[in-house]
Amino acid sequence: EPTMYGEILSPNYPQAYPSEVEKSWDIEVPEGYGIHLYFTHLDIELSENCAYDSVQIISGDTEEGRLCGQRSSNNPHSPIVEEFQVPYNKLQVIFKSDFSNEERFTGFAAYYVATDINECTDFVDVPCSHFCNNFIGGYFCSCPPEYFLHDDMKNCGVNCSGDVFTALIGEIASPNYPKPYPENSRCEYQIRLEKGFQVVVTLRREDFDVEAADSAGNCLDSLVFVAGDRQFGPYCGHGFPGPLNIETKSNALDIIFQTDLTGQKKGWKLRYHGDPMPCPKEDTPNSVWEPAKAKYVFRDVVQITCLDGFEVVEGRVGATSFYSTCQSNGKWSNSKLKCQPVDCGIPESIENGKVEDPESTLFGSVIRYTCEEPYYYMENGGGGEYHCAGNGSWVNEVLGPELPKCVPVCGVPREPFEEKQRIIGGSDADIKNFPWQVFFDNPWAGGALINEYWVLTAAHVVEGNREPTMYVGSTSVQTSRLAKSKMLTPEHVFIHPGWKLLEVPEGRTNFDNDIALVRLKDPVKMGPTVSPICLPGTSSDYNLMDGDLGLISGWGRTEKRDRAVRLKAARLPVAPLRKCKEVKVEKPTADAEAYVFTPNMICAGGEKGMDSCKGDSGGAFAVQDPNDKTKFYAAGLVSWGPQCGTYGLYTRVKNYVDWIMKTMQENSTPRED
C-alpha cells in the first residue's frame, strides 16, 4: 500500500550490521508524486566502487546511486548526509554486506517522503501538446482558443471534422487556408454524392503545401483520400505530388488531413465534382456492343449480340443477345453472361447407322454418320457429314438439319450362288446366297423381303391365312434352326385387287395378279443372312427377254421329298409363254383350256428339269440388274405351273411396281417416312 513517508534502517541499527546480509526495501508513494530519499547516517565499510558493502538506490531499471563509507552533513542546520530526488512513485533500496568487516560499522538510517512533481517541466517528453498545468499530485492540459482537448486529455486540435458535402460540385480547403493549418489535428471531410456518380477531385500543384516527409519518406503531416477500399495518398510536401485529377470510381469519398505538433505550412485547397459513374468498355469475346461508344457512363444501356455460332446460356435457355446497364457501382449488369460457343449437344442416333462420339459438340465441330455397311446405305445423300451450326443444330450441306436415313442395300447376296449339282433338279443353297428368302410355314411357301417392313409373296399363299408366320435368316427349316432364326410377325396382308378370290381355291385355273404384300409389325434387322431384294425399275431395261437367266429358291418339293429341309435353288432361263401353255397339266382340276395365261406372267424353266414346285410359291425369280450387275431384282414370283420339273409360271413383278409402291406408301408408319 503506498505511503507518504517512511524510515529505512540497516539491520541491527544503530548496532553494527551483520556480515553476509542482503536486504531490500520497496518504497511506493501514491501516483502523481515523486520520492525524496535522504540519509541521516551512513557508516558502511568503504571499498572501491562499494564492492564489499553497499546501499544501492534503484529507480525502475536505473541505479540512482550506490553508497558506502562514512558521511557527515555539510550543513550544520541539516542532518542529511546524502539525498535523492526521483520523479517516480517507486524506488528500491538494497543493502548488501560481505563475509567480513575489519571494523565495526553501524550501517545507515534513511527517510523518504512523497514530494510533488512538476509533470510539465520534470520530463523530457512534454505531456501536453499546448498548455501544461501542474498541481500537487498531478497535472492537466489545456488548449488555446478555437482548439479543443482530444479524448486523450493531452492533445489539442481544431474542430475541423464532421463536414459532409453532398453537392455535385464543391471546394474544400484545410483550416485557416492559406494561413498555416493547425498543428496536431485530424481533419476529416466526407463527400457523399448520389449513387451512380463518382467523385472526381482536382487540385493545382501550387494549392498544396504540407510539411514534407521525414528522411524515411514518411509524411509528418498528410492528406489522404479514401474511396471504399481504394486509397489515394498519403500526400505531403511543397506542391501536390499526386495526380491533379483523381477519379475515385466511388460516390463516397473521405478526405483525412493529419497534422503533427510541428512545421505548419499554408495547407491545401481542392475542388471536386460528381461525374456519372463510368463503366469500362469491357472486352466481351465473340460479341458486338450496340451502340458502340468510346465511353459508357451510369444509366447507359447496351445490347450485346453474340456472333454467329455463339449464344448466351442462362439457365437452360439459350439466347443470341442480352442487355447490360451501366450501374451505379460502375459495373455492368449481367456481367456474368458470356457469349459461349453454341453447343449442338450429343448428336441423335439413327436407325441402322452410327455416329462416332464427337470430340466436341461446340460450334464448328464436325461429325460423321455412317450406315451399317454393307447391309445399309445412306439413302438421302449428303455424305453423312454434319457440322455444328450457329443455330445449335447439326447441319448437313445437302440435308440441312434432317438426319441421314440408313436403308437396306437391296439385291446383294453376301455369297454368290454356285450350282453344285443338278426346288426340282436344283442345288443346295445357303441363305447367304438368297438373304431375301422368306419362309412361310402355313401354307408351306416362300416370299421375298423387299425392305425392312414389307414382304412380297404370291396372293395364293396368303389368301387362306391372313396372319402367316414367316421366318428369315435360316438355310434350314428344321425346328431347331427356325427357333434360332428371326420370326416375322405380320401386321396386315394386302392382296392385289385383281386377284380373284374363290370359294374353292383348289380348283383355281386363273392365277392372274398372283401377288400380295405383307406389312410387318416390326422392322427387320439386316445382316449377312437377311437382306432385301430390289424391285424392278420401270424402264424398258427391265423387260425380260427369252433366255434371260434368273434364280429361284425355296424349301418346296424336290425329287426326293415333299418339303426340303435345307434351301434349294436353281438357275432358269426365261421362256416364251407358249412353252408353258404347251405343257400338259399334271393333275388338272379343270379343262386344259380353262387355265389362264396373261402378260402378267413370266414363263421360265424347261432346262435340265430345273423348276419350282409345290412349296416354293411366293419366292422370288431373281434376275441380275441390267444397270448394276452386283444386284438382283425380283423379276418374278413363283406362282403356278402345269407340271413340276418342266416350265413354271411367275408373276411379272414389273407390271406391279406402281401398285407395290402405292401400297407401301399408303401404309407406311411415320417412323418409316
Epitope: 419362309f439 428344321q478 425346328t479 431347331s480 427357333a483 420370326m487 426326293k560 435345307r566
Partner: antibody
Framework: QVQLVQSGAEVKKPGASVKVSCKVS????????MHWVRQAPGKGLEWMGT????????IYAQKFQGRVTMTEDTSTDTAYMELSYLRSEDTAVYYC????????????WGQGTLVTVSS | DIQMTQSPSTLSASVGDRVTITCRAS??????LAWYQQKPGKAPKLLIY???SLESGVPSRFSGSGSGTEFTLTISSLQPDDFATYYC?????????FGQGTKVEIK
Amino acid sequence: QVQLVQSGAEVKKPGASVKVSCKVSGDTLTELSMHWVRQAPGKGLEWMGTFDPEEGETIYAQKFQGRVTMTEDTSTDTAYMELSYLRSEDTAVYYCVTEGLAGIPFDSWGQGTLVTVSS
Amino acid sequence: DIQMTQSPSTLSASVGDRVTITCRASQSISSWLAWYQQKPGKAPKLLIYKASSLESGVPSRFSGSGSGTEFTLTISSLQPDDFATYYCQQVNSLSWTFGQGTKVEIK
C-alpha cells in the same frame, strides 16, 4: 416316309458301355438331324442330344455330358449313340428320332432299344 | 439347360371333363413348345407344336395356348382314349428338354 430301325436290346454290367445304332431308310442321313431320347421304366422322357449339321457340332444334354457320344456314318445312313460308365439308373428304352420341320419337334421315331444295366 | 415344370403330376378326371395341364419354362421360350401323349409301351405321339398348332390327325378337343414361360394344354371333353401321360417339351434352344409328365387317370 422315313423309317428308323434300331439295334436290339442289350444287357450291360455297371461301368460298361453300350452303343445303340439307328438305320435310316426312305431318306438320307445328311438331310436329317438325328436326336436321341430315352425313357426309364415308369419314368418320363429325357432328351439326350443331337448332331447339329448347320453348326457341325453335337449338342448333349448337361446330364449326359462326358458320358455320351453321338456319331453318324453317312455312307450307311446309320446313326450311333454310345453311353459309357453305365449305372443301374441308365436302364431305359433308348429312341432315335428325326427332327421335324417348321416347329414340329420330331418326325419319325425308332422302335426303341431297351438297355438293361444290371450286375 | 431350360427347365420345364409340369403341373399337376397326376390328374384324376372323368369322361366328358374339361382338363387343363400347365407347363412352366425356367426362361422365355417364345412359342417353341410341343405337347405329347404317351400310352404305356408306345412311343410318344405329337399333339400340339408351336404352343398352339394342332398336329394333323389330332382331334380338335385338344388345344394349346401360351407363350413366353406359361403354357397350357386343354382337353375340352375328356374321352376314354385320352387317359394317358402327357409331356410338354421346349424346342426353343438346343438342348431340348421335357417336362416330368402329367398322368391323366380315371376318377
